[in-house]
Amino acid sequence: SNNKRAPYWTNTEKMEKRLHAVPAANTVKFRCPAGGNPMPTMRWLKNGKEFKQEHRIGGYKVRNQHWSLIMESVVPSDKGNYTCVVENEYGSINHTYHLDVVERSPHRPILQAGLPANASTVVGGDVEFVCKVYSDAQPHIQWIKHVEKNGSKYGPDGLPYLKVLKAAGVNTTDKEIEVLYIRNVTFEDAGEYTCLAGNSIGISFHSAWLTVLPAPGREKEITASPDYLE
């Protein structure tokens, strides 16, 4: 196309996480996906100065087609601010990431005491459960509901029936996954909810109960048997 255009970000979701706390010896990847016409070039700065290969043992890789900077086996001296500068003849844009290299002993995820907290609401109301997770290693977080199947909470193997309500995915930020919203609550929503956080060391989880009360001035509804999920 002949439409000349200054550089612009094409995928800001991939750039939302500015602070990267990474264990020593791990690989770090910073991305700045961009577009423009003519196609912009990308260069990287460390702490505001040109980032050269000789600035770190083992150098680094730049994947221009992926708009990425890759550093393998990071060490404490890699800590700092990394800025991508994307430019063409019509303009320049930049984005800065902060890298912290973690050397302390990684541990199981720690969940804040008292969270999620038990909650109660009336039928038709809204409720939210909050889970605060602290983890040296990147945690994977899930919200789980303990459900019934054929009137039983447990299967023939003695294990509980569970349904994953929400899990951290490619398009989910850490902040989004820390809160579970339940809108327009029904009696079937009552029960035990678990926030599970895991990392390479292990899994930790906290549970809370949701109590559902009849709406004021209404008889308690007689509900049909719900459709149970495996």
Partner: antibody
């Protein structure tokens, strides 16, 4: 049946390299962290390294940091340990151990399944 | 690093008699989720370690009920109510709360 099978052990001279492999079967390998643990002849157990289920996080014992690299290929259900600059004190049986899974668990969250081990001897 | 210390170093037991192994950790293994991440293993000659007890006191599947784990925070005990010939080997405690994961030095149990 859940199984871990190590291979790649052998006799090697100090300063040389060796690559160990662990083939996993009977469970969803890509959903579990994996560990290496070693045991010197007649001695106790020493944890060596761990890798997260997707390979994004790795941790090492101080005794092997900078020399050993843990990696995984989830498409092949394989865990590896690249051992460089080997020392006499690295002589041991190396065990592959299943770590924590990604989901809710009733029972231990890892360190329940061990391979039979592969012997590495570093000697001049 | 968390240091795990096991006593005694070895134990000679008459079949049918009880046995007790102690393990202490240099830091508390009680996690914020209320669980204590202390594991016990038995390693029989020529075999890899096998899990006996996880999270302080839970018996792993297939482990006989003569094995029990107890303790709190930093002091732990593995008890065998009635030792059998098949129980010989080296017993290890392990902390599973943070890396590096660490093991006790082991307790060798043999039959008199």
């Amino acid at each position: 049946e859940v199984q871990l099978l190590e291979s790649g052990g052998g006799v090697v001279q100090p300063g040389r390299s060796l690559r160990l492999s662990c083939a996993a079967s009977g469970f969803t390998f890509s959903s579990y962290a994996m560990h290496w643990v070693r045991q010197a002849p007649g001695k106790g157990l020493e944890w060596v390294a761990v890798i997260s289920y997707d390979g994004s996080n790795k941790y090492y014992a101080d005794s092997v940091k900078g020399r050993f690299t843990i990696s995984r290929d989830n498409s092949k259900n394989t865990l590896s340990l690249q051992m460089n600059s080997l020392r006499v004190e690295d002589t041991a049986i190396y065990y592959c151990v299943r770590g924590a899974g990604r989901g809710y668990t009733y029972g231990p969250d890892g360190f329940d399944i061990w391979g039979q081990g592969t012997m590495v001897t570093v000697s001049s | 690093d968390i240091v795990m210390t096991q006593t005694p170093l070895s134990l000679s037991v008459t079949p049918g008699q009880p046995a007790s192994i102690s393990c202490t950790s240099s830091r508390s293994l009680l996690h914020s989720d209320g669980k204590t991440y202390l594991y016990w293993y038995l390693q029989k000659p020529g075999q890899p370690p096998q899990l006996l007890i996880y999270e302080l006191s839970n018996r792993f599947s297939g482990v006989p009920d003569r094995f029990s784990g107890s303790g709190s925070r930093t002091d732990f005990t593995l008890k065998i109510s009635r030792v059998e010939a098949e129980d010989v080997g080296v017993y290890y405690c392990m902390q599973y709360i943070e890396a590096p994961l660490t093991f006790g030095g082991g307790t060798k149990v043999e039959i008199k």
